[in-house]
Amino acid sequence: TLNSVLNSNAIKNLPPPLGGAAGHPGSAVSAAPGILYPGGNKYQTIDNYQPYPCAEDEECGTDEYCASPTRGGDAGVQICLACRKRRKRCMRHAMCCPGNYCKNGICVSSDQNHFRGEIEETITESFGNDHSTLDGYSRRTTLSSKMYHTKGQEGSVCLRSSDCASGLCCARHFWSKICKPVLKEGQVCTKHRRKGSHGLEIFQRCYCGEGLSCRIQKDHHQASNSSRLHTCQRH
């Protein structure tokens, strides 16, 4: 099973399996017990943005970067911040939104071919370690990808959420990435509470839809920390 494969590949600090797979939002629990791992809820829209503590950019969503929320603020307190759009000031590539990169302190479009080689080097470097970032959602791996003309429907493979049709996000499924539905009110979501708690997100959930946030279900407040159920709720 995947569980035994994980153990035998010596991956440390994985969370215990949950009671259900995080594959298809709001769907039935998977009948395959070997693949029950937490999904992700890292890709908050700006409308329902929730601060997520981080130590590095890779812990944030595709449209975020990791930094101190206040200029010159406490370096020890960093959260995932919304990425910077074209022509905004930046200090490194990760600060710029997908499709852009940081050049001379400004986010510019990465469509130009000359930039692709630079990105490819970053991709290749990260492949040396068999057990690098388990969550694996580094934006650097997608900047140089071709642009799509048609938006992916549910189940279509994708590189980023902008490749998917409205109401869908790009999330991990098995070892690939596909378009999945953005979560609706009442659907189970995944809330990462602390650094290093992502686990191996084989089946990643989308984020909650507009006007919703991922919060503990009211009747689950008494439950133990490990079993608290989070659902998408109105602000």
Partner: antibody, heavy 117, light 112 residues
Framework: QVQLVESGGGVVQPGRSLRLSCAAS????????MHWVRQAPGKGLGWVAV????????YYADSVKGRFTISRDNSKNTLYLQMNSLRAEDTAVYYC??????????WGQGTTVTVSS | DIVMTQSPLSLSVTPGQPASISCKSS???????????LYWYLQKPGQPPQLLIY???NRFSGVPDRFSGSGSGTDFTLKISRVEAEDVGVYYC?????????FGQGTKVEIK
């Protein structure tokens, strides 16, 4: 045209190394996990290893763990299998296969590895 | 690991007659996404395995409609409505809901 083409097989002595390649075309390689599957002469099919779409996660069959390394170069649309400390029981036809998440896809023709002294 | 068990292991069929192969998995192959990750492959002599059926019952492009797949959960069947000479080879079922992917032992189909 969607296809996978394996290469790099050959005859090698026990204990030596070999590197297999799988060239992918006709689909968005960097969005898919990729697998290696093998078939020993006259035997059934056996899974060898998997790598996630971005290369961050890799898993191996117990029989090859610590000896084989799966990797990929998304800029070249190529999957690799570095095989070290080869044994006679590694003799097989090696196939690369795309992760089965959306539309299914046929395997390549395979590349033959023979480990013999 | 999920164990895939095929039966029979060999089958001798008269051309034009039907044939049926069973595949049982040790765990359910139904995923929470609603899909069941069960595949059927045919390996003709001297050739790589070729995909016949994906997700239990979907025929891969170019596969004749005499091939059909059915089943759910842990029990699956591949049927050939009228066997033809070109259908000889070894048929494998495979699951991909977990790694390692696992395969049935194979069913060798030959013509009488």
């Amino acid at each position: 045209q969607v296809q996978l083409v394996e290469s790099g097989g050959g005859v090698v002595q026990p204990g030596r190394s070999l590197r297999l390649s799988c060239a992918a075309s006709g689909f968005t390689f960097s969005s898919y996990g990729m697998h290696w599957v093998r078939q020993a002469p006259g035997k059934g099919l056996g899974w060898v290893a998997v790598i996630s779409y971005d290369g961050s996660d890799k898993y191996y069959a117990d029989s090859v763990k610590g000896r084989f390394t799966i990797s990929r170069d998304n800029s070249k649309n190529t999957l690799y299998l570095q095989m070290n400390s080869l044994r006679a029981e590694d003799t097989a036809v090696y196939y690369c296969a795309r992760d089965l998440v959306d539309t299914a896809m046929p395997w390549g023709q395979g590349t033959t590895v023979t480990v013999s002294s | 690991d999920i164990v895939m068990t095929q039966s029979p292991l060999s089958l001798s069929v008269t051309p034009g007659q039907p044939a049926s192969i069973s595949c049982k998995s040790s765990q359910s192959l139904l995923h929470s996404d609603g899909k069941t990750y069960l595949y059927w492959y045919l390996q003709k002599p001297g050739q790589p395995p070729q995909l016949l059926i994906y997700e239990v019952s979907n025929r891969f492009s170019g596969v004749p409609d005499r091939f059909s797949g059915s089943g759910s959960g842990t029990d699956f069947t591949l049927k050939i409505s009228r066997v033809e000479a070109e259908d000889v080879g070894v048929y494998y079922c495979m699951q991909s809901i977990q790694v390692p992917w696992t395969f049935g032992q194979g069913t060798k189909v030959e013509i009488k």
